[in-house]
């Protein structure tokens, strides 16, 4: 059976296509090619007479067609108007004609696309943004990329207009991109330049650093405030409710106890109209802001119950501190047998009983800091009960 095949089937505009003919019968007078799905003299492209080896152009001939002795038809410099069906009619020497129809599709070489946006400065959690991939072309597939990744599945991302439009519902600061669109057809593909979103957000709750609360007199107080915000936040400081200055950093040299108080950082975003504040307490004191870890020692760690006594000592080099004792997470002393002395430095147990066995530790603290020792284990033994002498009471 007579058939035709387009090589290639999908043709780039400006290129060429060859309509190949298979199973061409023997004993032919000639053949004609027509544009369309049927033989129509008004749409004849070319005819070829085998006897004279002469090609005759038809009404639909554009000058870009070449017919070959094997009936194949070459069309050069194709346009999108060339897309469609082509019919070959073979005039056989028995006067019975055969026909075969083929087709091809011409696609344009796609241009570099661009992205247009209906809002390039959206506000976080408030605005939606619609990106549109330009230009609009027929028979084109539109693809989107965010951060060089294909679109994630998200209820906030919507595709419409044949995937040509990407809508971000309720943008967040993480939606900055970059965004790229890609257009594809069967013969070409092209990707846009990246586009980034300037998402307006914040300010978030400010953070004051450093995190220190306690300072010694004579030190320099340098506080910095930061709140995530776009555009960057405008900052101001208040001390104990009184405005101080409009800067991101607050510096007070050579502080005194009088500089203790509430330090408030105020962050403002003039675009979103939002404000956030954070309050930090600063304490200026001679006390050590950091208490060293105390050492705990025992006069003996294994004692005989109801007989021995034991002294536990908590040692520290810090001054202006207090000491407290703990046994099995309970504060001491817990019985009349336990006594504290030398400013709670020593814990004495006399006599030791079975219930005193276990873990002990001490904690040193001042108004601004505390630290606790490693635990120490006290073991309580009992001697075997004395044998009865067998004498009857007297």
């Amino acid at each position: 059976q007579l058939t035709t095949e387009s090589m290639p089937f999908n043709v780039a505009e400006g290129k060429e296509v060859l309509l190949l003919v298979h199973n061409l019968p023997q004993q032919l007078f000639g053949y004609s090619w027509y544009k369309g799905e049927r033989v129509d003299g008004n749409r004849q492209i070319v005819g070829y007479a085998i006897g004279t080896q002469q090609a005759t152009p038809g009404p639909a001939n554009s000058g870009r067609e070449t017919i070959y002795p094997n009936a194949s038809l070459l069309i050069q410099n194709v346009t999108q108007n060339d897309t469609g069906f082509y019919t070959l009619q073979v005039i056989k020497s028995d006067l019975v004609n055969e026909e075969a129809t083929g087709q091809f599709h011409v696609y344009p070489e796609l241009p570099k696309p661009s992205i247009s946006s209906n809002n390039s400065n959206p506000v976080e959690d408030k605005d939606a943004v619609a990106f549109t991939c330009e230009p609009e072309t027929q028979d084109t597939t539109y693809l989107w990329w965010i951060n060089n990744q294909s679109l994630p599945v998200s209820p906030r991302l919507q595709l419409s207009n044949g995937n040509r439009t990407l809508t971000l519902l309720s943008v967040t600061r993480n939606d900055t991109g970059p965004y790229e669109c890609e257009i594809q057809n069967p013969v070409s593909a092209n990707r846009s330049d990246p586009v980034t979103l300037n998402v307006t957000y914040g300010p978030d709750t400010p953070t004051i650093s450093p995190s220190d609360t306690y300072y010694r007199p004579g030190a320099n107080l340098s506080l910095s405030c930061y709140a995530a915000s776009n555009p960057p936040a405008q900052y101001s400081w208040l001390i104990n409710g009184t405005f101080q200055q409009s800067t991101q950093e607050l510096f007070i040299p050579n502080i005194t106890v009088n500089n203790s108080g509430s330090y408030t950082c105020h962050a403002n975003n003039s675009v979103t109209g939002c404000n956030r504040t954070t309050v930090k307490t600063i304490i200026v004191t001679e006390l050590s802001p950091v208490v060293a870890k105390p050492q705990i020692k025992a006069s003996k760690t294994t004692v005989t119950g109801d007989k021995d006594s034991v002294n536990l000592t908590c040692s520290t080099n810090d001054t202006g501190i207090s000491i407290r004792w703990f046994f099995k997470n309970q504060s001491l002393p817990s019985s009349e047998r336990m006594k504290l002395s030398q400013g709670n430095t020593t814990l004495s147990i006399n006599p030791v009983k079975r219930e005193d066995a276990g873990t002990y530790w001490c904690e040193v603290f001042n108004p601004i800091s505390k630290n606790q020792s490693d635990p120490i284990m006290l073991n309580v033994n009992y001697n075997a009960l004395p044998q009865e002498n067998g004498l009857s009471p007297g």
């Epitope: 007078f29 033989v39 003299g41 085998i50």
Partner: antibody, heavy 121, light 111 residues
């Protein structure tokens, strides 16, 4: 069944005009080249003109060039011959004939019954 | 004066084989296909042979065509009385850009 039926012949004075028609049926008219062939009384056959299946290619015998015009209306399955400036030597039976080869191996496989054109004063 | 030359007449008896010649040039018979037509008295011509030697369906195989160089021949074997008619050869002529016929041969079946 293939049928070709000519009409429009008759008596006309020299210099006059006549339009012949050939109604085709029984085949796809638009797929075939068509010709007019004439035969003067008692004489042989003389080819007059041919028109391709789409009407894009037309040829005439030297003896009629400029006076006779061939045309076709594929929507009406009809072939025409417009005859102007008629002469006595145009007197003949005019046949329309079908070429099944689209002109690649010109031949006439079906003929009409003919219509007589007489040019006389 | 016809471009293709045929004998004005030919004859034969029933059952006989008769040949009618057609002579032309390289611009017609030499490079193009030849057809033969039969015209019975008072009727339109009928195609007998096309493409030099091919018979359309319905034409008896008593009719055959051949070609050599710039000449063509129609042979009728087993001649019958109903074969009495005028016979024309025809071909496309590249120099005229038109179809040309021979002057016709009148075949008479004797007896």
């Amino acid at each position: 069944e293939v049928q070709l039926l000519e009409s429009g012949g008759g008596l006309v004075q020299p210099g006059g005009s006549l339009r012949l028609s050939c109604a085709a049926s029984g085949f796809t008219f638009s797929n075939y080249a068509m010709s007019w062939v004439r035969q003067a009384p008692g004489k042989g056959l003389e080819w007059v003109s041919v028109i391709s299946h789409g009407g894009g290619s037309i040829y005439y015998a030297d003896s009629v060039k400029g006076r006779l015009t061939i045309s076709r209306d594929n929507s009406k399955n009809t072939l025409y011959l417009q005859m102007n400036s008629l002469r006595a030597e145009d007197t003949a039976v005019y046949y329309c004939a079908r070429d099944p080869t689209k002109g690649y191996a010109p031949t006439f496989d079906y003929w009409g019954q003919g219509t007589l054109v007489t040019v006389s004063s | 004066q016809s471009v293709l030359t045929q004998p004005p007449s030919a004859s034969g008896t029933p059952g006989q084989r008769v040949t009618i010649s057609c002579s032309g040039s390289s611009s017609n018979i030499g490079n193009n296909y030849v057809s033969w037509y039969q015209q019975l008295p008072g009727t339109a011509p009928k195609l007998l042979i096309y493409a030099d030697s091919r018979r359309p369906s319905g034409v008896p195989d008593r009719f055959s065509g051949s070609k050599s160089g710039t000449s063509a021949s129609l042979a009728i074997s087993g001649l019958r009385s109903e074969d009495e008619a005028d016979y024309y050869c025809g071909a496309w002529d590249a120099s005229y850009n038109g179809y040309v016929f021979g002057g016709g041969t009148k075949l008479t079946v004797l007896g």
